[in-house]
């Protein structure tokens, strides 16, 4: 249940999240499967952990192999595992099967290309992008963030893509690249102003104080494909990533496309350990395309814990 | 309501085996951790067993190699297997909720079944 | 293991008179979280235990406010300001640091 296949190129750094999350205030400990033996914390090593993340600056494919981390949680020490497999660099220009990263599919009104893992990185824009191994060069082509546009798509703008980025650690850099098939879809779609499904205008959620809150932003967006889409969160009008407070988090759901054909998004906005404070703070759902923006403000206000189970009745 | 079940107790001779269910309503049994505790007449409460929610499972040296504790989560339901049982193992058994193992949220083991009672005798 | 220990064994109390419980752990009981996973559980006769205290000092749903948690690192004190008669029963401490262990029990009954 808590484990997870991940795969680099020596010579390049790879980064691993632990498959068994926990609070961030939590230690977690690696350890080398096979020999129990721990795993360093100290960044001088080529291999070390660092929370819930276990790096390989560089990798070698000697360090392929399953390792375990364990989170040191109450109650339980939690146990995931990471299956590692490091190989060796292509000396053409194929790219195997067991390297790529989940196909993606885009049309003429939606062409973004994601760079997969990138999040788990220290990475400055901008990525380079690479099709078939060639470098991608012309105007139809734009690096955005941790995504590759493509405009006008049209059939032969279908597969494979690397993207190319560089990883920083404390001053050193190390390369990465990750490859992606690209597929293209002949759709009949069409794009019109955001309509928010949740939440609602001005809802009222109820949250407990010290537990962990959830706020989903779910937008449609027509039929089809989107060109330019996007829902996010904002706190008091500021962006989540500018907001500075490390609890509060939004996650990217996954596209939807309903029974009826509506493209529709979601973003996830988790709060963990809900403070008093984040009850004074206004929670604005945006949804966003080429016809205009749409906002849903939602408030917080405490919930008093069920009283699953009265003692004295 | 918030609700543990436990069935499954009796008389069983030494050497033999036992399996206790534990039926739970009233809450997303998935995402609890969940335990089973035992009392020996006139004794204190000792930890059995337990389970998170991804199914992994622990014990004390007393149980561990013996008693095996599982969890079928579509069916809201806890089991404790008790294999070669000794008379040092008569005691009622309580199934309880642990922390939410999802959210990493403790309030303490709070939610008790009513007991069934394991008699291990010749 | 975590080993707890509870004093007194056995506590004869006046209804209306306060009443003090001591909980100590062999080794601190502070997680990185912030929290002390210490908890208090009430078994009245013929019942099953009754979730008190959680986490040192947060009273659970539907206890009255008598009852009071504190305490720190390896010592923690359960108190109730006036005994009731429905108070009578076998006190526990738990730890839920690591797996759980239960103390010995505090016997509490009416003189």
């Known amino acids: 249940k808590f484990s997870k296949q991940s795969w680099g190129l020596e010579n390049e750094a790879l980064i691993v999240r632990c498959p068994r999350q926990g609070k961030p205030s939590y230690t977690v400990d690696w350890y080398y499967s096979q020999t129990n033996k721990s795993i360093p914390t100290q960044e001088r090593n080529r291999v070390f952990a660092s929370g819930q993340l276990l790096k390989f600056l560089p990798a070698e494919v000697a360090d392929s192999g399953i390792y375990t981390c364990i989170v040191r949680s109450p109650t339980f020490n939690r146990t995931g595992y990471a299956n590692v497999t490091i190989y060796k660099k292509q000396s053409d220009c194929n790219v195997p099967d067991y390297l790529m990263y989940s196909t993606v599919s885009g049309s003429e009104k939606n062409s973004k290309i994601y760079c997969p893992t990138i999040d788990l990185y220290n990475w400055t824009a901008p990525l380079e992008w690479f099709k078939n191994c060639q470098a991608l060069q012309g105007s139809r082509y734009r690096a955005h963030k941790s995504f590759l546009v493509i405009d006008n798509v049209m059939t032969e703008d279908a597969g494979d893509y690397t993207c190319k980025f560089i990883h920083n650690e404390n001053g050193a850099n190390y390369s990465v690249t990750a490859t992606r098939s690209f597929t293209v879809k002949d759709e009949q779609g069409f794009s019109l102003f955001p309509v928010i499904g949740a939440p609602a205008q001005n809802e009222i959620k109820e949250v407990e104080i010290g537990k962990n809150a959830n706020l989903t932003c779910s937008a449609c967006f027509g039929k089809g494909t989107q060109f330019l889409a996007a829902v996010l969160w904002q706190l008091n009008g500021t962006k989540i990533t500018d907001f500075g407070e490390p609890r509060i988090q939004q996650e990217e759901g996954q596209n939807q496309s309903f029974s009826n054909g509506l493209a529709c998004l979601d973003m996830v906005l988790r709060i963990a350990d809900v403070k008093e404070e984040d009850l004074l703070l206004q929670y604005d759902c945006l949804a966003l395309n080429l016809h205009g923006l749409r906002r849903h403000t939602v408030r917080l206000s405490r919930k008093n814990p069920i009283d699953h189970h009265s003692i004295y009745c | 309501e918030v609700q543990l079940v436990e069935s499954g107790g009796g008389l069983v001779q030494p050497g033999g085996s036992l399996r206790l269910s534990c039926a739970a309503s009233?809450?997303?049994?998935?995402?609890?951790?969940m335990h089973w505790i035992r009392q020996a007449p006139g004794k204190n409460l000792e930890w059995v067993s337990a389970?998170?929610?991804?199914?992994?499972?622990y014990y004390p040296g007393s149980v561990k190699g013996r008693f095996t504790i599982s969890r079928e989560d579509a069916k809201n339901s806890l089991y404790l297997q008790m294999n070669s049982l000794r008379a040092g193992d008569t005691a009622v058994y309580y199934c309880?909720?642990?922390?939410?193992?999802?959210?990493?949220?403790?309030?303490?083991?709070?939610?008790w079944g009513q007991g069934t009672t394991v008699t291990v005798s010749s | 293991d975590i080993v707890m220990t509870q004093s007194p064994l056995s506590l004869p109390v006046t209804p209306g008179e306060p009443a003090s419980i001591s909980c100590r752990s062999s080794q601190s009981l502070l997680h990185s979280d912030g929290y002390h996973y210490l908890d208090w559980y009430l078994q009245k006769p013929g019942q099953s235990p009754q979730l008190l205290i959680y986490l040192g000092s947060n009273r659970a749903s539907g206890v009255p406010d008598r009852f009071t948690g504190s305490g720190s690192g390896t010592d923690f004190t359960l108190k109730i300001s006036r005994v009731e008669a429905e108070d009578v029963g076998v006190y526990y401490c738990m730890q839920a640091l690591q797996i759980l262990t239960f103390g010995g029990g505090t016997k509490v009954e009416i003189k």
């Open positions: 009233g809450f997303t049994f998935s995402t609890y951790d």
């Open positions: 309880a909720r642990g922390g939410d193992g999802y959210n990493y949220d403790y309030y303490g083991i709070d939610v």
């Open positions: 389970i998170d929610l991804a199914g992994d499972t």
